[in-house]
């Protein structure tokens, strides 16, 4: 036979404490039973009766063992800048997160209470501290050999591209242009080979230069317009 | 964080008494019942009891109900395990626990002290 | 008292592996069974309550399972840190009582 043997409610020993999932009970001076999660108690104990507990009735919860009159109520439905994370349920509360982009201002217990976008570094500047759940994007500016060309709330300065001749030198918003002088393969005569335009390079969360090919037969073209370069027919 | 850091190992004569002391920090103290487990070398761990540090009220296996004292100084956050009548059976590692009264469980547990009982 | 019984007391395994440990209680426990870990000098850990709840800090390879008297703790892929003596306990009635261990081992 279990220890646990006294059906509540009890009077305990002097000096003792009430068992598992029970409470003692002020008014009845008892040892009674608590409400599961999921419930509350309808009916306190009294000497001879014990806790009567009652579902929690929709959008409302109790998430602990308890002998709460009535359950809490769950938090109001979540905004638009919110994902609901967590349903609310007879044993728990809703929880609203912020969604891709954003980042919690103001949080509560569970969740967050307030959503705020993160911040974008303009060209110029790059990521210095990523955004987390709790924390906005610190941005820097690209300090001299590195540049960043978007706005971006991910971007980091990126070296500039190493040229044997510097067709236009970069700047912290544009990357460096070359020029050929001895190409490496047989080309016509002041041609120029374009690969993918900056706008498509992957992004790369560290900065890792990007292999140079030597000596460069390429360039990069830089966003909006740029004078043609040395030898092009143009358009 | 939380934490429960026990008073260093001692070693007994049989019929002798040892008191263990345990220090809480990190949380509100008179909140959460302080456990009792004990190891024997070798051995699982034994359930001693439990005293709840608001009113100093305690629960008992009642394998030791009559040899346990538990007590507690809530000024300093800690708690006392005191074993009476000791023999050699009793040689074990004494740890002290936060416990949860609803599902059972000890979720941060003490060093550990060792208790030596030896003629 | 309610009996814990684990299935084995040691267990040998490699990292990388799918471990379970099982642990049997002598009566219906509902889904009060907790499980721990325990390594040499270091402090006891909870790891898993109420049959399945992960206590915060966990890592989500461990997981529980079962109900009423046969209960299982899943490691999802060992890790060198596994490696430990795991204890099951039951928190439906006192006193509290836990099973025998199970030690964990390299392969």
């Known amino acids: 036979l279990p220890a646990q043997v006294a059906f509540t409610p009890y009077a305990p020993e002097p000096g003792s404490t009430c068992r598992l999932r029970e409470y003692y009970d002020q008014t009845a001076q008892m040892c009674c039973s608590k409400c599961s999660p999921g419930q509350h108690a309808k009916v306190f104990c009294t000497k001879t009766s014990d806790t009567v507990c009652d579902s929690c009735e929709d959008s409302t919860y109790t998430q602990l063992w308890n002998w709460v009159p009535e359950c809490l109520s769950c938090g109001s439905r979540c905004s638009s800048d919110q994902v609901e994370t967590q349903a609310c349920t007879r044993e728990q509360n809703r929880i609203c997160t912020c969604r891709p982009g954003w980042y919690c201002a103001l949080s509560k217990q569970e969740g967050c209470r307030l959503c705020a976008p993160l911040r974008k570094c303009r060209p110029g500047f790059g990521v210095a501290r990523p955004g987390t759940e709790t924390s906005d994007v610190v941005c820097k500016p690209c300090a001299p050999g590195t540049f960043s060309n978007t706005t971006s709330s991910t971007d980091i300065c990126r070296p500039h591209q190493i040229c044997n001749v510097v067709a236009i030198p970069g700047n912290a918003s544009m990357d460096a242009v070359c020029t050929s002088t001895s190409p490496t393969r047989s080309m016509a005569p002041g041609a120029v080979h374009l690969p993918q335009p900056v706008s498509t390079r992957s992004q790369h969360t560290q900065p890792t230069p990007e292999p140079s090919t030597a000596p460069s037969t390429s360039f990069l073209l830089p966003m909006g317009p740029s004078p043609p370069a040395e030898g092009s027919t143009g358009d | 964080q939380v934490q429960l850091v026990q008073s260093g190992a001692e070693v007994k004569k049989p019929g002798a008494s040892v008191k263990v002391s345990c220090k809480a920090s990190?949380?509100?103290?008179?909140?959460?019942?302080i456990n009792w487990v004990r190891q024997a070398t070798g051995q699982g761990l034994e359930w001693i009891g439990w005293?709840?540090?608001?009113?100093?009220?305690?629960q008992f296996n009642e394998n030791f109900q009559g040899r346990v004292t538990m007590t507690r100084n809530t000024s300093i956050s800690t708690a006392y395990m005191e074993l009476s009548s000791l023999r050699s059976e009793d040689t074990a590692v004494y740890y002290c626990?936060?416990?949860?009264?609803?599902?059972?469980?000890?979720?941060?547990w003490g060093q550990g002290t060792t208790v030596t009982v030896s003629s | 008292d309610i009996q814990m019984t684990p299935s084995t007391s040691s267990l040998s395994a490699s990292v990388g592996d799918r471990v379970t440990i099982t642990c049997r209680a002598s009566?219906?426990?509902?889904?009060?069974l907790n499980w721990y870990q325990q390594k040499p000098g270091k402090a006891v850990k909870l790891l898993i309550y109420?049959?399945?709840k992960l206590h915060s800090g966990v890592p989500s390879r461990f997981s529980g399972s079962g109900s009423g008297t046969d209960f299982t703790l899943t490691i999802s892929s060992l890790q060198p840190e596994d490696f430990a003596t795991y204890y099951c306990?039951?928190?439906?009635?006192?006193?509290?009582?836990f099973g025998g261990g199970t030690k964990l081992e390299l392969k």
């Open positions: 626990a936060r416990g949860d009264r609803d599902y059972g469980y000890f979720d941060v």
């Open positions: 990190g949380y509100t103290f008179i909140t959460y019942d």
């Open positions: 009566q219906d426990i509902s889904n009060y």
């Open positions: 109420f049959k399945s």
């Open positions: 005293i709840y540090p608001r009113d100093g009220n305690t």
């Open positions: 306990q039951q928190g439906n009635t006192l006193p509290l009582t």
